[in-house]
Each structure stands twice: as structure tokens, then as C-alpha cells.
């Protein structure tokens, strides 16, 4: 058993049929010595008396808010949550496996630049009685500070018969060094509590591996005289690290016909312009990637050819 | 060429070669690393590779003030990785396919380090730890880790030379 926060405790249980459970001793936070009784949640049934209460925690029915009273007055509370371990593996019932980039990916994170700011998100089908708490650091043995905000519900979508809820959090490394080569990964820890179930999820990454630039901005076409060719130009996204002579991007320019089956013409360039042939009803799209490190491409910025 | 005395390197040549290094490092190991390394013992692996750290002067301001600190750090790293790529970790079993980009990568690391430090001048170089894996599969693990960290190292080096070529070239 360990303390999650003041008056909230997590009991770690091996979860299998007829498991013996864990013996837990609760102590009433009071100078009083006698006349103390204990109840669980809203029940008025007295579970025991005395300054300590010993309970055998085996299932969710044994978890909840234990309260000690004296003469009708509440002295203190202890909330017990359960953390299940099945076949040596901690349960992951609350969050959905996003399966990208690999199985057992519950947290996904992205950064728009090298500033040390990043966003993580996760999915669940649970809509109520759900709380999240996020902590982060750079490295684990001698951790350096990363400050995370509160997790918020960022999207709701319908998947078949189910509703899916996306939560996200923004974090910022306290003393980020954008130009340095990271040697210690960022660690992100999410505590999830649904009713009386506790679970924790972790992710470890280098900022360089989660970079995904915003799409190029100000995408424009300039027809070339007496030619089917056009000059496409664009700019670095505002959110990208500066100076651009140091934090350089590379670009992919694509000409795509109306039909998805039509052959796509692609050009790769380090410049912020390119000359392409504009077919009727086609569109021109440009996306960006770090020039020197193969992290994710941005989403496409597009303009129609006409 | 960057010499210990402090003259300027051939920024544009360094920029071209460092960008080639980035391409080679990614073609040698294109995965972004979704291999399951957790089940493999890490005892035989190393984290002692040189990193370009915050105080090494490789940021745009540091380069403007005095690029020598940064260039020396890059040179140290290039020599370190060049030795690693020529070591038993990469020459031992399982042997690399004949068309593996590691050979070119090895030669380019040497080429860039020579551009930075001509014959007759010597910057200190970092000792490479003697890593001779007792199991062939551990070489795979070390290759993986070395190439992943080399990708990060050459990315910073390429940024330095690109910025130098754009803003510090005579």
C-alpha cells in the first residue's frame, strides 16, 4: 500500500480467483484514543472500533472511503483505491491501446518544435468518475524538471456504438536547450483513477523523436508565362524553431489529381519554392519534416491548381 | 578547416558532408526504433557516447561568439563514432551485408573529421570504451543503440554547419 496523495492510498493486489488479498491497517488521524468507530462509504454499518482498523482487501467491495467517527463527528477519511496485477502485469483497463506506433501504446506525444514544449494525449471509452494526474521529468535517476498542466477533455468522437473520449495535456521542460543533443529521455507518468480503480501509464521519449512540424504556411501558386508549370512557394510554420538557418526543414511537394487513383507527382526540396506542372482539377500539397532528423512529417498544406 | 589555433572551417564543405552523413545514418538504420529492446539485457551496452550538450557552444549564439568549442566537440564525436563503426561491433558477426551503408558512413565520418582537423593538429579525443560483446546478438543491440545516437549527433552537427555556412562563412 502506498499514498497517492493526502488521505488517498493505493492497494496493490495480485488479481486471480481466491487470491488472499492484502491486509491493510488504517489509522484514524486524531489525538482521540477511544470511542472511535469506522464506516465505509455511505453505509452506517460499523466495521470496527478503535484508533486502528485492520481489513483484508481482496476486491473492489473492500475499497472506498473509510471514515473514522466519534460521537457522530467525522475525525478523518482514508480513500482506498485498487491497483490490479494479473499474471504479473498491471491492468490497463482505463485507457485504450492506440496501437500506433506499436502495440501497448496508451500515451502518444508530439512536439511542434525543439522548445521543450510537447503535448500528450490518450483515449478512453469511460465518460464519468474519471480523473487524471500527469507528472513528467527529464531522466529518472536524477530528474530535471518538466511542468505539466491539467489534463483536459480535448475531443469526443463516435466509434461504432461507442463514444471515445480524448484527453490531452501540455508540458514544458523547465530549462530546455533546443540546440543540444538529448542524452536523457523525457519521462511522462499518467495516474488514472476510475471510481476505485487506479492505473498508471508511462511513456519515455526524446523530443527529437516526437517532433511533428505544423504544416507550411502561406502556400501560394504563381503561374509561369507560356507554360503549364507553376511556381509553388510557402513559408516555414510560425511554430517552428528559429533561426531557420539552424533549425532547417525539408519539404515534400505533391501534385494530386481529383481521383485518389491518379499517379501522384512528388518533389523533395530544401527550398521554400518549387516548380511543378499543374494539372486541371489537381491540387498541390506541401508538407515539412526536420531536415536532419527523420521524425514525423507535418500534415499537408494544400491549394487547388485552378 | 578548423584548426586548434582558431581559423574558420570550410563551412560549406562541412555542411554538404554533414548532410550526407545524416542521410547515410538514416539509410543504415531507417527504423525510428520501434524494436522491442526491453527484453534484451542492457549490461553490455553503453551510454558513454559523446553528446553535444548545452554548454558546448553549438547553439546559434555560441557559434557566433566562438565556434571553436563546438567544432572541437563535434570533432571528438566524429572520431569516437568513426572508431566505433570500425570496431568489432560492426565488423564482427553477424556480418553486415556487402551493400550496407555502414561502410560509407564510416568513411564519411572520417572525411568530415579530417575537414575539421587537418594533419599535424591534434585536439583531444575521447577514449572509446572497449566493447567486445560476448554474444553475437548483443552486437545487434549495440549497433542499434550506436546508430540511433549517431543519428541524433549528426543532426546537431549538420545544423551547426548549415548555420555556419549561412551566417559565418567569409
Amino acid at each position: 500500500i502506498w499514498e497517492l496523495k493526502k488521505d488517498v492510498y493505493v492497494v496493490e493486489l495480485d488479481w486471480y480467483p481466491d487470491a488472499p488479498g492484502e491486509m491493510v491497517v488504517l489509522t484514524c488521524d486524531t489525538p482521540e484514543e477511544d470511542g472511535i468507530t469506522w464506516t465505509l462509504d455511505q453505509s452506517s454499518e460499523v466495521l470496527g472500533s478503535g484508533k486502528t482498523l485492520t481489513i483484508q482487501v481482496k476486491e473492489f467491495g473492500d475499497a472506498g472511503q473509510y471514515t473514522c467517527h466519534k460521537g457522530g463527528e467525522v475525525l478523518s477519511h482514508s480513500l482506498l483505491l485498487l491497483h490490479k496485477k494479473e499474471d504479473g502485469i498491471w491492468s490497463t483497463d482505463i485507457l485504450k491501446d492506440q496501437k500506433e506506433p506499436k502495440n501497448k501504446t496508451f500515451l502518444r506525444c508530439e512536439a511542434k518544435n525543439y522548445s521543450g514544449r510537447f503535448t500528450c494525449w490518450w483515449l478512453t471509452t469511460i465518460s464519468t468518475d474519471l480523473t487524471f494526474s500527469v507528472k513528467s521529468s527529464r531522466g529518472s535517476s536524477d530528474p530535471q524538471g518538466v511542468t505539466c498542466g491539467a489534463a483536459t477533455l480535448s475531443a469526443e468522437r463516435v466509434r461504432g456504438d461507442n463514444k471515445e473520449y480524448e484527453y490531452s495535456v501540455e508540458c514544458q521542460e523547465d530549462s530546455a536547450c533546443p540546440a543540444a543533443e538529448e542524452s536523457l529521455p523525457i519521462e511522462v507518468m499518467v495516474d488514472a483513477v476510475h471510481k476505485l480503480k487506479y492505473e498508471n501509464y508511462t511513456s519515455s521519449f526524446f523530443i527529437r523523436d516526437i517532433i511533428k512540424p505544423d504544416p507550411p504556411k502561406n502556400l501560394q501558386l504563381k503561374p509561369l508565362k507560356n507554360s503549364r508549370q507553376v511556381e509553388v512557394s510557402w513559408e516555414y510554420p510560425d511554430t517552428w524553431s528559429t533561426p531557420h538557418s539552424y533549425f532547417s526543414l525539408t519539404f515534400c511537394v505533391q501534385v494530386q489529381g481529383k481521383s485518389k487513383r491518379e499517379k501522384k507527382d512528388r518533389v523533395f526540396t530544401d527550398k521554400t519554392s518549387a516548380t511543378v506542372i499543374c494539372r486541371k482539377n489537381a491540387s498541390i500539397s506541401v508538407r515539412a519534416q526536420d531536415r536532419y532528423y527523420s521524425s514525423s512529417w507535418s500534415e499537408w498544406a494544400s491549394v487547388p491548381c485552378s | 578547416r578548423a584548426v586548434p589555433g582558431g581559423s574558420s572551417p570550410a563551412w560549406t564543405q562541412c555542411q554538404q558532408l554533414s548532410q550526407k552523413l545524416c542521410t547515410l545514418a538514416w539509410s543504415a538504420h531507417p527504423l525510428v526504433g520501434h524494436m522491442d529492446l526491453r527484453e534484451e539485457g542492457d549490461e553490455e551496452t553503453t551510454n558513454d557516447v559523446p553528446h553535444i550538450q548545452c554548454g558546448d557552444g553549438c547553439d546559434p549564439q555560441g557559434l557566433r561568439d566562438n565556434s571553436q568549442f563546438c567544432l572541437q566537440r563535434i570533432h571528438q564525436g566524429l572520431i569516437f563514432y568513426e572508431k566505433l563503426l570500425g570496431s568489432d561491433i560492426f565488423t564482427g558477426e553477424p556480418s553486415l551485408l556487402p551493400d550496407s551503408p555502414v561502410g560509407q558512413l564510416h568513411a564519411s565520418l572520417l572525411g568530415l573529421s579530417q575537414l575539421l582537423q587537418p594533419e599535424g593538429h591534434h585536439w583531444e579525443t575521447q577514449q572509446i570504451p572497449s566493447l567486445s560483446p560476448s554474444q553475437p546478438w548483443q552486437r545487434l543491440l549495440l549497433r542499434f543503440k550506436i546508430l540511433r545516437s549517431l543519428q541524433a549527433f549528426v543532426a546537431v552537427a549538420a545544423r551547426v554547419f548549415a548555420h555556419g555556412a549561412a551566417t559565418l562563412s567569409p
Epitope: - | 524494436m35 558477426e93 553477424p94 553486415l96 551485408l97 560476448s134 554474444q135
Partner: antibody, heavy 126, light 111 residues
């Protein structure tokens, strides 16, 4: 075509040594390893060790506690396996095999004992 | 050392029937969670062994009635339709860790 030709059968006294040769032809000797495997009469296969002439690496089965020495002569494309302090339980057919052990930088991992010698029967008897 | 345990020791199967040979390692013989360092060899009487399955790949020239599967510690070689020429002893071999080790062998005969 690829061939591995082993030296002839040997009868040895306990305590003595035997050196079996394996001459390779039909391929570039240094591009592959040579593995030694033995098989006692009516028994299974036992890996003894292997040598890679190009890298100079040799791997041994510690079970033989220094009794086995595997070498290669690149000039004649011949591999050798010497086993010392012979005992009766060393009576076996000794095979050499060409070992191809390659990978892309980190995986996949290809290991094949793809060509074998005809085997050399070593009998240890007093 | 990694111990390779094969089962059964021998197997009698009718012509055209399926033969299944198991090999269990005392420790994982996959690398990075996916690449297999487990191989299958066939040995006919009086001959040296012959490689038939390499990791997860059937050797060229080996009939496709042979198939290999498994990962981690448990592996299987299946002959989907046994032919007379498949009568032999089959060995698994791990080369994840030195010393490389063979299983004890499974003798396949015709019933």
C-alpha cells in the same frame, strides 16, 4: 560448386589429440565462417564452435574447457579443429559446415549452416 | 546454456498426414521481440544435416509442405503432408547465445 572436404577417419588413444582438417572450395573462404559439429554414434548433434576468418572471431562451446582449438589458414582455404586430452566419449563423427551469418545493420538475423563436409569419424580407444 | 527440448522423441505418421514437431527453449531465442534465432535441420541416415528452415524463412529448394512457426521459447515445425522422402531426424538449433545448442532430435517415420 561449394565443397567442404574433410580429412580421413582417425583412431586415437585416450589422452592424445586429433586434428581434423576441412578444405573449402567453390566460394570466397573469408566471406563465411566454418562451424564444427559432432555426433556421437546414435546420438544427436553437438555444436563445438565456429571461426570467422574475416573478422578473426572464434566462438567456442565452453563444455570443451579449452580442449578444442579451431583455426583457419586463409592461404589454403582450410579450417582445422583440434581436440586434445581425448577420452572414449569423444568418439564421434566430426562435421565441418560453412556458416553464413549476416544481418542488415540490426536485423533480420540470418544464420545458415548451408554446406557440410562428409564427416570424419574419430574413434578413441585404448 | 540455453537448453533446447524437442518433443516427441519419435513420431510415426501415415503418408499424406500432418507431422508436428515441437521445440522448447529454456530461455527466449527471439531477438528484439521478433527476429527468430531458431533454425530447423533435417538429417537422413548416413548423411550430414541439411538446413530446411532458417528463422522464419523456408530455405530455397525445400518443399513448401514444411512450415515453421513460434516465437519466444516455443517453436513448431510442421510437415503438412508427409512424403516418403521426409523420413529423417529433425533437429532445432538456437544461435541466439553461444554455445549454440541443438535439440535432442525427433525421428519421423511412416506409419
Amino acid at each position: 560448386q561449394v565443397q567442404l572436404v574433410q580429412s580421413g577417419a582417425e583412431v586415437k588413444k585416450p589422452g592424445s589429440s586429433v586434428k581434423v582438417s576441412c578444405k573449402a572450395s567453390g566460394y570466397t573462404f573469408t566471406s563465411y565462417g566454418i562451424t564444427w559439429v559432432r555426433q556421437a554414434p546414435g546420438q544427436g548433434l553437438e555444436w563445438m564452435g565456429e571461426d570467422y576468418p574475416r573478422s578473426g572471431n572464434t566462438y567456442y562451446n565452453e563444455k570443451f574447457k579449452g580442449r578444442v582449438t579451431i583455426t583457419a589458414d586463409k592461404s589454403t582455404s582450410t579450417a582445422y579443429m583440434e581436440l586434445s586430452s581425448l577420452r572414449s566419449e569423444d568418439t564421434a563423427v566430426y562435421y565441418c559446415a560453412r556458416a553464413e551469418f549476416i544481418s542488415t545493420v540490426v536485423a533480420p538475423y540470418y544464420y545458415a549452416l548451408d554446406y557440410w563436409g562428409q564427416g570424419t569419424l574419430v574413434t578413441v580407444s585404448s | 546454456d540455453i537448453v533446447m527440448t524437442q518433443s516427441p522423441d519419435s513420431l510415426a505418421v501415415s503418408l499424406g498426414e500432418r507431422a508436428t514437431i515441437n521445440c522448447k527453449a529454456s530461455k527466449k531465442v527471439t531477438i528484439f521481440g521478433s527476429t527468430s534465432a531458431l533454425h530447423w535441420y533435417q538429417q537422413k541416415p548416413g548423411q550430414p544435416p541439411k538446413l530446411i528452415y532458417n528463422g522464419a524463412k523456408l530455405e530455397s529448394g525445400v518443399p513448401d509442405r514444411f512450415s515453421g512457426s513460434g516465437s519466444g521459447t516455443d517453436f513448431t515445425l510442421t510437415i503438412s503432408s508427409l512424403q516418403a522422402e521426409d523420413v529423417a531426424v529433425y533437429y532445432c538449433l538456437q544461435n541466439k547465445e553461444v554455445p549454440y545448442t541443438f535439440g535432442g532430435g525427433t525421428k519421423v517415420e511412416i506409419k
